[in-house]
């Protein structure tokens, strides 16, 4: 299926040009999306191109500038947040990135009623996290690992926690491993729906081993960065959850929420918190061996001022074939009765589907079913449930939005997006206003992305929010590669692949092949999305064929494929890439003497193992910031898929699955190894150990390090990286510069 046909005709050939590397590095062909910042059922805020904060009323079609760019600029604000009572706006400046989600910033509070900044009891700086209560204008913030509360922005703060300490105790914010591998947020505090209570997590990292690496900077002596970072099998953070009454915070103080007995009996994690009402909260817990998850619904006991979590309100989710959930354990979406909920988990056939839980998980009512997967529940209203899935036309790499009418019996299902812009749009997400009165659809491709606004009752399109007209015009004279998404059936396994072909692709000719791989558990690379990136350039200008293959371990095609890699990382992911390459060779247009593979992070691990597979298929390859041994990576992620690196558990496979163990096999390939020295995620240690093993085996290889760069290799390093990799590949494929 050709998704993005090249617009080349003989008459046009002279005016059309190929993509250049410069186009990619300059972001010439980047696209915009439009996510409304909903503030009611029919109003949203948006930051205009000239940096005004504009309020839109959908029903009247009117727009209002509520905060001028002048005010924003006066404090160099890069972000804002309107209080729910619309009295105040916080302005965020001095953004300073920490890890993937976390950053610190300076916050100013602007009073909309008098058009002045709030003076007196100003916020300290830098703040680690700040948010408004869901109602009114209370503020909760985290400063120096402690949580503070303000009843009004101008009031003095009330200090909730006192034990916060850098790298030791974290209150209201996650430590490194919880941020990256469990919560995927910069915060660990949650307001109750009406702002009566504030729940928060406390992470104790006192006993966690520390990763230390040099940050060279430009001083005479490098700094040492220390991060409590539990690697596989190491001591983990100890987590506790507390709830405080924000109306009378000093009355009884924070109350701890009890951990379910079956969880507390051994090492465990807290995985998420969902408020149901002001006096009912739902916590999710996970055993360290991550195949058992417990959802616990707790109620406020007014008489004791405590939180009670009866065993009858504990729901257990267990996997017998792999780990619990997909990448994370899914979170519940509660219905209006405030006790029953909707949740995605595996059905009896091993496909992730929406279930309705009223009393017990055993009695769950399955809402969706089929050999496809429900991916996200967006919103549940009185009469509708909105979700996304990859059901339509049996393409796992698509996402469409569906509505199930839960108010009628039997419930009826409607695909909201399937036929809207069928050729252009096959991969959607959505953003809903209060009560799902309106929603925005954001289409990511395969055509040029487009964001639209819709009526939540009729699904009618109201207006286009962003259609990327400038991008469309800019691409008019570009020879884009062709893209096709197809599947291979091999030994009862379906391998979906995306192939990116040069604009004048001719099946009778031979082309060099580059495999781009990620391949991590519960990932998906073959998606119907738009992208003009490095591999687009390699196909357009350099005449390469690029392929992406989703093998065993990847997501949204059922548990059989997903859990195939359980306790055995580094085996089937590699096998499936190799199998696909052999099939591509059989297609007749691949030059089998010019095949390369590259990947980043988990993809760097897979590409390294593929190069060292001894098949002789690959001439060369690149690993960027690869994992080299699972003993070096984070406990929460690694143990989910590999168990523990102990003799009585899975130490043997931990040892067998390292890149270093295969050092000898790199002798007959050209290998480029790349890593940032300040990678907090996949530590430089991983590449240092590969390099050491290759040197010890007297195997020649190429390497590049990026000083003081993290896992993302951003800024000028990006340009250097892609230029360097381009030269390497062109040399490998004997392409002239």
């Amino acid at each position: 299926i050709v998704l993005r046909p090249s617009r080349v005709h003989n008459s046009e050939e002279n005016t059309m040009r190929a993509l250049t590397l410069k186009d990619i590095l300059n972001g010439t062909f980047s696209y915009k999306t439009f996510f409304p910042n909903w503030i009611s059922g029919q109003e949203y805020l948006h930051q205009s191109a000239d940096n005004n904060i504009v309020l839109y009323n959908i029903e009247t079609g009117q727009s209002y500038t509520i905060l001028s760019n002048r005010t924003m600029k006066s404090v160099n604000a890069s972000n804002y947040g309107l209080s729910p009572d619309r009295q105040f706006v916080y302005l965020e400046s001095d953004y300073s990135k920490l890890w993937r989600y976390s950053y610190t910033a300076t916050y100013y509070i602007y009073d909309l009623s008098n058009g002045e900044f709030v003076r007196g009891n100003e916020l300290p700086r830098p703040i680690q996290y700040l948010c408004w209560s869901p109602v009114g204008s209370k503020l909760a913030y985290v400063y120096q690992n402690n949580i503070y509360l303000k009843q009004r922005p101008g009031d003095p703060p009330f200090q909730i926690t006192f034990n916060g300490r850098e790298n030791k105790i974290f209150n209201g914010i996650p430590d490194w491993v919880y941020e990256e591998e469990m919560l995927a947020t910069k915060y660990a505090l949650w307001w109750s729906p009406n702002g009566k209570f504030l729940a928060y997590a406390e992470f104790n990292d006192t006993d966690i081993p520390v990763i230390a690496y040099s940050y060279y900077g430009d001083e005479q002596y490098p700094r040492t960065i220390n991060i409590p970072y539990p690697k596989a099998g190491a001591k983990n953070p100890v987590v506790r959850i507390f709830i405080i009454d924000t109306t009378y915070p000093a009355y009884v103080g924070p109350q701890e929420v009890p951990v379910p007995a079956m969880i507390a009996s051994s090492d465990y994690y807290f995985s998420w918190l969902t408020w149901v009402t002001d006096e009912r909260v739902c916590l999710q817990w996970l055993k360290r061996v991550q195949n058992v998850s417990v959802l616990s619904i707790c109620d406020f006991r007014e008489d004791w001022q405590t939180w009670d979590c009866p065993k009858t309100q504990e729901h257990i989710e267990e996997s017998r074939t792999g780990w619990a959930g997909g990448f994370f354990v899914s979170t519940p979406v509660f219905s209006y009765d405030a006790i029953s909920y909707y949740k995605i988990f595996s059905d009896k056939d091993g496909y992730k589907h929406i279930h309705y839980i009223k009393d017990t998980v055993e009695n769950a009512i399955q809402i969706t079913s089929g050999k496809w997967e429900a991916i996200n529940i967006f919103r549940v209203t009185q009469d509708s449930l909105f979700y996304s899935s990859n059901e339509f036309e049996e393409y796992p790499g698509r996402r469409n939005i569906y509505r199930i009418s839960i108010g009628s019996y039997p419930p009826s299902k409607k695909c909201v997006t399937c036929h809207l812009r069928k050729e252009r749009c096959q991969y959607y997400t959505a953003s809903f206003s209060d009560y799902a009165k309106y929603y925005a659809l954001v289409c990511y491709g395969p055509g040029i992305p487009i964001s639209t606004l819709h009526d939540g009752r009729t699904d009618q399109e109201i207006k286009i929010l962003e259609e990327n007209k400038e991008l469309e015009n800019a691409l008019k004279n570009i020879q884009l590669p062709k893209e096709e998404i197809k599947k291979l059936e091999v030994d009862e396994i379906t391998l979906w692949y995306k192939m990116i072909l040069p604009p004048q692709f001719d099946r009778s000719k031979k082309y060099p092949l580059l495999i781009q791989v990620y391949g991590g558990p519960c990932s998906q690379s073959v998606r119907s999305v738009f992208a003009v990136n490095w591999i687009s350039y390699l196909a357009s200008k350099e005449g390469m064929v690029i392929a992406l293959v989703d093998g065993r371990g990847t997501a949204f095609q059922g548990d059989k494929l997903l859990y195939a890699v359980y306790r055995k990382l580094g085996v089937y992911e590699v096998e499936d890439q190799i199998t696909a390459v052999r099939k591509f060779i059989e297609m007749g247009f691949i030059d089998e003497k010019r095949i390369a593979i590259w990947g980043w992070s988990y993809g760097g691990y897979v590409s390294s193992l593929a190069l060292a597979s001894g098949t002789g298929l690959f001439k060369c390859g690149i690993a960027v910031a690869p994992v080299s041994s699972w003993e070096y990576y984070a406990s929460v992620y690694t143990e989910r898929f590999m168990g523990l690196p102990t003799k009585d558990d899975n130490l043997e496979h931990y040892k067998n699955s390292t890149v270093m163990a295969r050092a000898e096999y790199f002798r007959n390939v050209d290998y480029l190894l790349i890593h940032g020295t300040a990678d907090d995620n996949v530590h430089f240690q991983n590449s240092a150990q590969i390099a050491k093993a290759l040197v010890n085996a007297q195997v020649d290889f190429q390497a590049m390090w990026y000083s003081d760069q993290n896992h993302g290799l951003s800024g000028l390093s990006t340009n250097h990286l892609y230029t360097h990799m381009t030269h390497f590949l062109k040399q490998c494929f004997s392409l002239s510069d």
Partner: nanobody, 123 residues
């Protein structure tokens, strides 16, 4: 509780001006945010301009630069000066009040209303 009474509407030619007034009863006028809404036949009631207790103002983009809202707390009055009027400004103009923030654009969020005054702009 506050009662509102508008005045100053009428028939005016395009590019003309009108000054609408809204007088409020009660001694706590200064504690209310005030707004001017309008409703044309068959259309939603829409916010034109609003002014907070502290005097901050904001406007619908369609009237920005042409209309000015102001308040006189001593006189319990809010004004809407309308200049460079266009035929599409023709509507019934309503004065509204609410406790708290002025930054609400849905008419349902404003509990107190006047009876309205007709503004007709001829071309």
């Amino acid at each position: 509780q506050v009662q509102l009474q508008e005045s100053g509407g009428g028939l005016v030619e395009a590019e003309g001006s009108l000054r609408l007034s809204c007088i409020a009863s009660g001694r706590t006028f200064g504690t209310y945010a005030m707004g001017w809404f309008r409703q044309a036949p068959g259309k939603e009631r829409e916010l034109v301009a609003a002014i907070s207790t502290g005097g901050s103002t904001y406007y619908a983009d369609s009237v920005k630069g042409r209309f000015t809202i102001s308040r006189d707390n001593a006189r319990n009055t809010v004004y809407l000066q309308t200049n460079s009027l266009k035929p599409e400004d023709t509507a019934v103009y309503y004065c509204a009040a609410r406790r708290g923030s002025a930054y609400y654009t849905n008419h349902v969020d404003w509990p107190y209303w006047g009876q309205g005054t007709q503004v007709t702009v001829s071309s």
